[in-house]
Each structure stands twice: as structure tokens, then as C-alpha cells.
């Protein structure tokens, strides 16, 4: 499955939108930094079949979409930017879903790569727990925004490697 060129442009647009979403000076949030334990090894792309990598990417985008679709997220970010960001993620999910079906067939996808998908889910659980503990403060969201930018960059790099394998 070849992800369309518009997919990588969508990645870039999503990162730009996320960068634009900042509302407070990040410098005031230094003490709120937190180790979310991003599962970097799941995104190095070496040990995966293409289908497995796509399923992990899909989970990453899905969880990001879920995180930024909550009521708490709506209260934290400028609405039009948030909507544009969600739209970009939604389009990426559609592209990746089409690819997953093409690569492995519908029957196999739920069983694929469960450990990696679980690692991504636990990572997002840690992010949600952090936000809850910090009472969804502006700085907590700022730290999470920085973290998601970093993790989406890893996702983008994995997608680039997948395209080079084609």
C-alpha cells in the first residue's frame, strides 16, 4: 500500500497546527516537565513488517485524535485550530485504515502487533493520568502538546522509512 503524497503533507500540517496551538509562554512551564515514557522502540521501524508498522502508526494517530477530542481539550485550545488539527488527524486515520486493510486483510488486523499497540495505549494512559493529576492546567496541556509534537515527529519519521522501503 502506498500512502498518498497528501498523507505526508497532512502529517506536516498537523505538526504545524499543533505548534500554533500554544497559548502561554512555554518558559513558565519548565517545572511541569514529565517523563511519559514514549515507546520509542515501537517507532524505530526495523523490527516491523510494513503492516505492523502501519497498525502502530494508526494507534498513535487514533489515540492522539481521542486525546484532543475531549471536552477538557476543547476548553484548553483555540477552537478553529483544534478543529483543523482534528480534521488532519481524521484524514490520516482514513489513509492508514485503507492501508491496513490492503496490507493484511481485515481478519488479521485485530491480532497484529498487540504488544506494540498496547505500549502505545499505555503511553496515552500515562498522559491522561498526568493531565488529571495536574487538573488539566494550562502548563500541563503545554507539556502534553510538546510531548505529542515529539511523538508525532517519530511517527512521521517512521512513515518516511516505510516509503523508502517501497
Amino acid at each position: 500500500c502506498d500512502l498518498p503524497q497528501t498523507h505526508s503533507l497532512g502529517n506536516r500540517r498537523a505538526l504545524i497546527l499543533l505548534a500554533q496551538m500554544g497559548r502561554i509562554s512555554h518558559f513558565s512551564c519548565l517545572k511541569d516537565r514529565h517523563d511519559f515514557g514514549f515507546p520509542e522502540e515501537e517507532f524505530d521501524g526495523h523490527q516491523f513488517q510494513k503492516a505492523q508498522a502501519i497498525s502502530v502508526l494508526h494507534e498513535m494517530i487514533q489515540q492522539t485524535f481521542n486525546l484532543f477530542s475531549t471536552e477538557d481539550s476543547s476548553a484548553a485550545w483555540e477552537q478553529s485550530l483544534l478543529e483543523k488539527f482534528s480534521t488532519e488527524l481524521y484524514q490520516q486515520l482514513n489513509d492508514l485504515e485503507a492501508c491496513v486493510i490492503q496490507e493484511v486483510g481485515v481478519e488479521e488486523t485485530p491480532l497484529m502487533n498487540e504488544d506494540s499497540i498496547l505500549a502505545v495505549r499505555k503511553y496515552f494512559q500515562r498522559i491522561t493520568l498526568y493531565l488529571t493529576e495536574k487538573k488539566y492546567s494550562p502548563c500541563a496541556w503545554e507539556v502534553v502538546r510538546a510531548e505529542i509534537m515529539r511523538s508525532l515527529s517519530f511517527s512521521t519519521n517512521l512513515q518516511k522509512r516505510l516509503r523508502r522501503k517501497d
Partner: antibody
């Protein structure tokens, strides 16, 4: 390979202006902040300030606020430190270093080679 | 501002010695402390970040510990290339601040 390359040594007279540079390569320049650190001859390290090149937001140490200006041009992956009127006491080695911002990652993991600024009449 | 106080300011040691440098913050900084090594005429080099994480490529004889206000850098067996000045730096809040440095010299 990540690199921060600083501009060359400068010899200036008191009252003159100066702008030194720090060019980043081998990484996404806007994903990291750039900090500036002063080291006067035979002395320790002093943090001066920092910039987020993605939006040019800055923070300064109170000791350096109003004395220097930090800026960045993300189109050429370069951060700057400038003085409008140098003093003899500005004579020092100046280092730039990258900072991961709000991410949980090593602070100041890569440094420039330093720019020696000498101010003398 | 958070003040960082290192001790000792200098020490003499021999190759193979275990060396300990301490750093104290004027208020709690959780675990947001970094250690750097600097040799004459060179830029500082990050050794330890977030109090105890060893920076990639740094020998395992270097270790860091502590949290709150009291921190320690330990060199388990001093090597000839370890003679340098060491700085702690709080990474908890702006303005970032460094300790005054500890010079490790050959006995």
C-alpha cells in the same frame, strides 16, 4: 550529526555593537530551544537566556535582561546574541547550547564551540 | 532565583580514586539537576541529566543521585581524562543556574 557552529572570535571597542551567531544542523531546529551561556576568563558558567526558535519567545536571566538581545531566524536555523553597546566587562567566551524545551530529554546536550568576545580600548 | 552551591570547590585525587562532588539547591528542584564536565579551552559536556540519567556516550563510572535539594556526582574510579572542572545546573525553573564549579586536579 547534530552540530551547533558559532561565529568566530571578535575584538571590539567599548560602546560598539555586536551580533554573534549559532547555526544548528543535523536536527529539527524549531524542535529545540537554544540557550546562551557566558564564561568570563577563569570563571564559571552563567546562564544568560534562551529562545524558542519556533516562535522567537525568549526568557532572560535577570542579570542579563536589558543588556543583551537573543533572536533567531528559523529559515536559516540560526540563533543570535547581540549587544548594542559593549563594555569591557563583556569580555568572555559565549556558548550556545540546545535545550529540549518541555520534553523529558537531556538538557543542553549539544554545545557550540564557543565565541570569544574581547572588548578593549 | 535558585542558588546552587557545589562542594568542594576543588579537590586533588589520584587515578583510580573514588571521587564525590555534592551540589545543594537553595530550594527543592525535585530531580531537575544536570552535571557537566569542562576541560580547559573546551565547551562543557553533559554527563548526567535529571539527577541520575547517564547521557549517551558517557562512561558508566560516572553516576548521579539525589533529589529535592541535595545531589551527588560520583566518579567510581578516576581516569586520567577525568581531570577537569565539573558543574551542576538546576533545570527546574528559570532563570537556570549553575553551581560555581569543582576543579578535580591530579594529586
Amino acid at each position: 550529526e547534530v552540530q551547533l557552529v558559532q561565529s568566530g572570535a571578535e575584538v571590539k571597542k567599548p560602546g560598539e555593537s555586536l551580533k554573534i551567531s549559532c547555526k544548528g544542523s543535523g536536527y529539527s531546529f524549531t524542535s529545540y530551544w537554544i540557550g546562551w551561556v557566558r564564561q568570563m576568563p577563569g570563571k564559571g558558567l552563567e546562564w544568560m537566556g534562551i529562545i524558542d526558535p519556533s516562535d522567537s519567545d525568549t526568557a532572560y536571566s535577570p542579570s542579563f535582561q536589558g543588556q543583551v538581545t537573543i533572536s533567531a531566524d528559523k529559515s536559516i536555523s540560526t540563533a543570535y546574541l547581540q549587544w548594542s553597546s559593549l563594555k569591557a566587562s563583556d569580555t568572555a567566551m559565549y556558548y550556545c547550547a540546545r535545550h529540549p524545551g518541555l520534553n523529558w530529554a537531556p538538557d543542553f546536550d549539544y554545545w557550540g564551540q564557543g565565541t570569544l568576545v574581547t572588548v578593549s580600548s | 532565583d535558585i542558588q546552587m552551591t557545589q562542594s568542594p570547590s576543588s579537590l586533588s585525587a589520584s587515578v583510580g580514586d573514588r571521587v564525590t562532588i555534592t551540589c545543594r539547591a537553595s530550594q527543592s528542584i525535585d530531580g531537575a539537576l544536570n552535571w557537566y564536565q569542562q576541560k580547559p579551552g573546551k565547551a562543557p559536556k553533559l554527563l548526567i541529566y535529571f539527577a541520575s540519567s547517564l547521557q549517551s556516550g558517557v562512561p558508566s563510572r560516572f553516576s548521579g543521585s539525589g533529589s529535592g535539594t541535595d545531589f551527588t556526582l560520583t566518579i567510581s574510579s578516576l581516569q586520567p581524562e577525568d581531570f577537569a572542572t565539573y558543574y551542576c545546573q538546576q533545570a527546574y525553573d528559570f532563570p537556570l543556574t549553575f553551581g560555581q564549579g569543582t576543579k578535580v586536579e591530579i594529586k
